[in-house]
């Protein structure tokens, strides 16, 4: 025998109380398959969250965030604050990376510049709290009668040294 | 964490009204659908009905005498009960869940109940 609920469309449900007839989902809930013997409440987007597509009767509202915060979790499911670039959120805010690090995002965490050296190469240009350094040619590249590159003037940080990590 | 305090419960006699308030603490009700079980001694619960977004679904058995109803500004859910019966007689739970209607589903969280005694 054919269950009476399988004929009930998305967007209704199929009333126990009510013979099995299919009754529409209230307002502000979904079901988004047929043959449900409930609706889900809608979510709702408050506070720091606003709505990127409204809840309909077959499918659920979608959330983001407000500016100056973005989306973190399965489907948004908090808002974390926004940073600058050359900064990380920490417990107590935003903050400027460490010397040697740096962030070119509005989020994440102050990622350690990379170590020329490491992959036998010269520092192009310097890292800064926003931009990881850049890796030229390997310092044996650079001999005398090769097309020369001057090396950048150093930042304006003192002793800026591009093999410290914090 | 959500706290669901059901009030209103006693002794009536048969053909009285009741009217048993649910307020949640920790939380609104505002994304929540509200529901009311009952559980008389000796007896499997039953469902009452459930409150979402001005719209009441309830049970098979309570003929028009329930009505359920919600004061958002007090975040208190009510149950109206008129012309009770004896066998009425039951602890009566408030419960919220994301699903609407409750007939079938275990709620998200439940009081701890209050008792309705019809008798004369």
């Known amino acids: 025998l054919q269950d009476p609920c399988s004929n009930c469309p998305a967007g209704t449900f199929c009333d126990n109380n009510r013979n099995q007839i299919c009754s529409p989902c209230p307002p502000n809930s979904f079901s988004s398959a047929g043959g449900q013997r409930t609706c889900d409440i809608c979510r709702q987007c408050k506070g720091v969250f606003r709505t990127r597509k409204e809840c309909s009767s077959t499918s659920n509202a979608e959330c983001d965030c407000t500016p100056g915060f973005h989306c973190l979790g399965a489907g948004c499911s908090m808002c974390e604050q926004d940073c600058k670039q050359g900064q990380e959120l920490t417990k107590k805010g935003c903050k400027d990376c460490c010397f040697g690090t740096f962030n070119d995002q509005k989020r994440g965490i102050c990622r350690p510049w990379t170590n020329c050296s490491l992959d036998g190469k010269s520092v192009l240009v310097n890292g800064t709290k926003e931009r990881d350094v850049v890796c030229g040619p390997s310092p044996a590249d650079l001999s005398p009668g090769a097309s020369s590159v001057t090396p950048p003037a150093p930042a304006r940080e003192p002793g800026h040294h591009h093999h410290h990590h914090h | 964490q959500v706290q669901l305090v059901e009030s209103g419960g006693g002794t009536v006699q048969p053909g009285d009204s009741l009217r048993l308030s649910c307020a949640a603490s920790g939380r609104t009700f505002d994304n929540y659908a509200v529901g009311w079980f009952r559980q008389a001694p000796g007896k499997e619960r039953q469902y009452v009905g459930t409150y979402w977004s001005g719209y009441a679904h309830y049970g098979d058995f309570e003929n028009n005498r329930f009505t359920i109803s919600r004061d958002n500004a007090k975040n208190t859910v009510y149950l109206q009960m008129d012309n009770l019966k004896p066998e009425d007689t039951a602890v009566y739970y408030c419960?919220?869940?994301?699903?609407?209607?409750?007939?079938?589903?275990?709620?998200?969280?439940q009081g701890q109940g209050t008792q309705v005694t019809v008798s004369s």
């Open positions: 419960a919220i869940s994301l699903k609407y209607p409750m007939a079938t589903v275990t709620p998200d969280y």
